[in-house]
Amino acid sequence: LPAQVAFTPYAPEPGSTCRLREYYDQTAQMCCSKCSPGQHAKVFCTKTSDTVCDSCEDSTYTQLWNWVPECLSCGSRCSSDQVETQACTREQNRICTCRPGWYCALSKQEGCRLCAPLRKCRPGFGVARPGTETSDVVCKPCAPGTFSNTTSSTDICRPHQICNVVAIPGNASMDAVCTSTSPTRSMAPGAVHLPQPVSTRSQHTQPTPEPSTAPSTSFLLPMGPSPPAEGSTGD
């Protein structure tokens, strides 16, 4: 014959544990029912009565089977630099993630504690590593033969156009200018190279920034919380 199923509350056999979705109440010394997600223990069990569960109040939750006397408070409303990717319900906490163009600079167990805008790379620098949900952009100086004339968190260094005759040589922050109506070829895949003036290439074309007082040694600041490597300020 099958063993008789015990109904909560019941005294466990010596050395045995309570079943799934049950807990051992030290005071009653009985195995008692846990409350389901979205509920909490309103009245703890006794030797003769099981746990009495009640629904979580607004703005509180329990995610797991439990016997907590009070539901957990949902996190505060998402800040202006965040979006709510999971609403506060009786069964789950609110989760806030950073809005597009921002990254999580200080994380917490679930979601993000503090968002920061993705930094942009200045003219003469391109994106070495794009920003992610949890890390900032990393910039790198444009190598000889390449340039970036934008302030952008996405633009990489692009090759200078190749000219039959060069009117103005390119540098790290400006494309080469050709004297002929069109360049012989461009190393930039899929890029459309317009004839002069070069400013038609980008709405953000800028003259080469004047030198700053920054040192000539190069310096890459970190992506997210990782230490920087040294390299050129490009100033």
């Epitope: 630099d81 920061a116 200045r122 800028q206 003259p207 310096f219 890459l220 490009g234």
Partner: antibody, heavy 121, light 110 residues
Framework: QSVEESGGRLVTPGTPLTLTCTVS????????MGWVRQAPGKGLEYIGF??????TYYANWAKGRFTISKTSSTTVDLKMTSLTTEDTATYFC?????????????????WGQGTLVTVSS | DIVMTQTASPVSAAVGGTVTIKCQAT??????LAWYQQKPGQPPKLLIY???TLESGVPSRFSGSGSGTEFTLTISGVQCDDAATYYC????????????FGGGTEVVVK
């Protein structure tokens, strides 16, 4: 290259005031400019900055009361409202170093001499 | 919010000696840290950025170290001219913060 602040004066509480930062030899479309203040005998206090692309960021306490804007190719303004005696300080304008090729790093390598704002009744 | 805490003032040093100033961040800021020197009546002067990179024109007796939450500014072979207040500043977070600067540490040279 230089940075100079102007507009600091004695004002009564509640009076709005605008400070101007005038730069020379600095392209404001390439560099980020910030404001920092220092109360008499106290430490440095970050206010905020305006990036080369025109985005503004502020310290929590400055949000809503302080506004940074570019007013020309050589000037950046700091507009202050609802001033109290706690706002008495020397206000510095400074250029972001742009280290690592970043548009802004929050680290300033060229500072003006500052302009004194006194709020008193 | 990230808060920067510095060595209490004042710190005394003899000419030719060594001074160490510590700066602690409440959260990891990687190497986004700068050190400034300020003398009375003058604006701050950037000494070090990236925790350890010396700004152009700054004497090599100044050095910086650390990453994460613990940082140090060291002045070796202290000179009379080094008497000033020194500030650390984090550049990791510049929005949703109350201040990016530490409280400052005054160095007195005897």
């Amino acid at each position: 290259q230089s940075v100079e602040e102007s507009g600091g004066r004695l004002v009564t509480p509640g009076t709005p005031l605008t400070l101007t930062c005038t730069v020379s030899g600095i392209d404001l479309s390439s560099y980020t400019m910030g404001w920092v203040r220092q109360a008499p005998g106290k430490g440095l206090e970050y206010i905020g900055f305006i990036s080369s692309s025109g985005h503004t960021y502020y310290a929590n306490w400055a949000k809503g009361r302080f506004t940074i804007s570019k007013t020309s190719s050589t000037t950046v303004d700091l507009k202050m409202t609802s001033l109290t005696t706690e706002d008495t300080a020397t206000y510095f304008c400074a250029r972001d170093g742009g280290y690592g090729g970043y548009d802004y790093t929050g680290i300033f390598n060229l500072w003006g001499q500052g302009t004194l704002v006194t709020v008193s009744s | 919010d990230i808060v920067m805490t510095q060595t209490a003032s004042p710190v005394s040093a003899a000419v030719g000696g060594t001074v160490t100033i510590k700066c602690q961040a409440t959260e990891s800021i990687s190497s986004w840290l700068a050190w400034y020197q300020q003398k009375p009546g003058q604006p701050p002067k950037l000494l070090i950025y990236g925790a350890s990179t010396l700004e152009s024109g700054v004497p090599s007796r100044f050095s910086g170290s650390g990453s994460g939450t613990e940082f140090t500014l060291t002045i070796s072979g202290v000179q009379c001219d080094d008497a000033a207040t020194y500030y650390c500043q984090q550049g990791y977070i510049y929005t949703n913060v109350d201040n990016t600067f530490g409280g400052g540490t005054e160095v007195v040279v005897k």
